[in-house]
Amino acid sequence: QRLSRAQQQLPLESLGWDIAELQLNHTGPQQDPRLYWQGGPALGRSFLRGPELDKGQLRIRRDGIYMVHIQVTLAICSSTSTSRHHHPTTLAVGICSPASRSISLLRLSFHQGCTIASQRLTPLARGDTLCTNLTGTLLPSRNTDETFFGVQWVRP
């Protein structure tokens, strides 16, 4: 749709075009399967425009339908990652808070591979915090072209 001249002067955030692209900061301590993310121009090609980070987890600030995408590459990866040497390694993206809205949005398994990637459209609400859980003990790559996570507001 075309934007009016007045709309063109507004920052993207005020138009509802919230968007974020994050890179992996670190994995959690023992018994914490979450991945912790970071973003900002000083870090490279990651950024937050609207959404915010809360202790490494992505929090939505505007209601709407979002495209959620993620790619994770394992730095420790084996052709037997999903067989006898390891329990299957699974990546799950979900709303982890508030608890009343907790739900899994994406679930992927590393089937004899080192990289998984997926995306989906889903409604998200202000205050939703997205968590990315990587089961098992395998370490994900922190290379920014191998592991990244983001959301893009699409429509109300």
Epitope: G28, Q30, D32, S78, S81, T137, S141, R142
Partner: antibody
Framework: EVQLLESGGGLVQPGGSLRLSCAAS????????MSWVRQAPGKCLEWVSV????????NYAESVKGRFTISRDNSKNTLYLQMNSLRDEDTAVYYC?????????????WGQGTLVTVSS | EIVLTQSPGTLSLSPGEGATLSCRAG???????LGWYQQKPGQAPRLLIY???SRATGIPDRFSGSGSGTDFTLTISRLEPEDFAVYYC?????????FGCGTKLEIK
């Protein structure tokens, strides 16, 4: 300057236990995965174990799984390797090594090593 | 696990000469995730090359790495006296990471 200093090696009988330590300095210890690599006398290098910067996701070589435990104390900038049920074939120089920031298991800094001898 | 075979086992050369060290993998190394280390007697290994061809910090440009798939090479263009040591290759694309058993570079 990155420095890694191992300690705790020595002579131990088969079936015995030993705890190795590695004191790290010169970098933000909690930001990096750390590893143990060993070298038996006159033999090849062998990767032993790795642990993430936050202390989770330990991984082990099949040869030590169930007998060795890697851990770290980020408040003390120290890496540990608890070795139980030691065998003759565990005799080696044990090196503490810093893992590259990417988490890929190549090692940009190494300690000088500590010798573990398992013998009766 | 991926077996790495280094050749030759020993290489006898003189300072000023060039050296070519080979590392062959039993199966393809993921994304050329292969490194080279130098080890002198009584010392810890030192990282020279990672990603098959990237020099580690502080490594002189006479050291270069090349190769992909299963065949990799470390080249030292002009040998200095301090370059005589044992050289190990290591793959880290698949777990467990594995090392070759080394090439000893000795003074002729």
């Amino acid at each position: 300057e990155v420095q890694l200093l191992e300690s705790g090696g020595g002579l131990v009988q088969p079936g015995g236990s030993l705890r190795l330590s590695c004191a790290a300095s010169g970098f933000t210890f909690s930001s990096y995965a750390m590893s143990w690599v060993r070298q038996a006398p006159g033999k090849c290098l062998e990767w032993v174990s790795v642990i993430s910067g936050s202390g989770g996701r330990p991984n082990y070589a099949e040869s030590v799984k169930g007998r060795f435990t890697i851990s770290r104390d980020n408040s003390k900038n120290t890496l540990y390797l608890q070795m139980n049920s030691l065998r003759d074939e565990d005799t080696a120089v044990y090196y503490c090594a810093k893992v590259d920031y990417s988490n890929y298991l190549f090692f940009d800094y190494w300690g000088q090593g500590t010798l573990v001898t398992v013998s009766s | 696990e991926i077996v790495l075979t280094q050749s030759p086992g020993t290489l006898s050369l003189s300072p000023g000469e060039g050296a070519t060290l080979s590392c062959r993998a039993g199966q393809s190394v993921r994304s050329s995730y292969l490194g080279w280390y130098q080890q002198k007697p009584g010392q810890a290994p030192r990282l020279l090359i990672y990603g098959a061809s990237s020099r580690a910090t502080g490594i002189p440009d006479r050291f270069s790495g090349s190769g992909s798939g299963t065949d990799f090479t470390l080249t030292i263009s002009r040998l200095e006296p301090e370059d005589f040591a044992v050289y190990y290759c290591q793959q880290y694309g698949y777990s467990p990471p594995t090392f070759g058993c080394g090439t000893k570079l000795e003074i002729k």
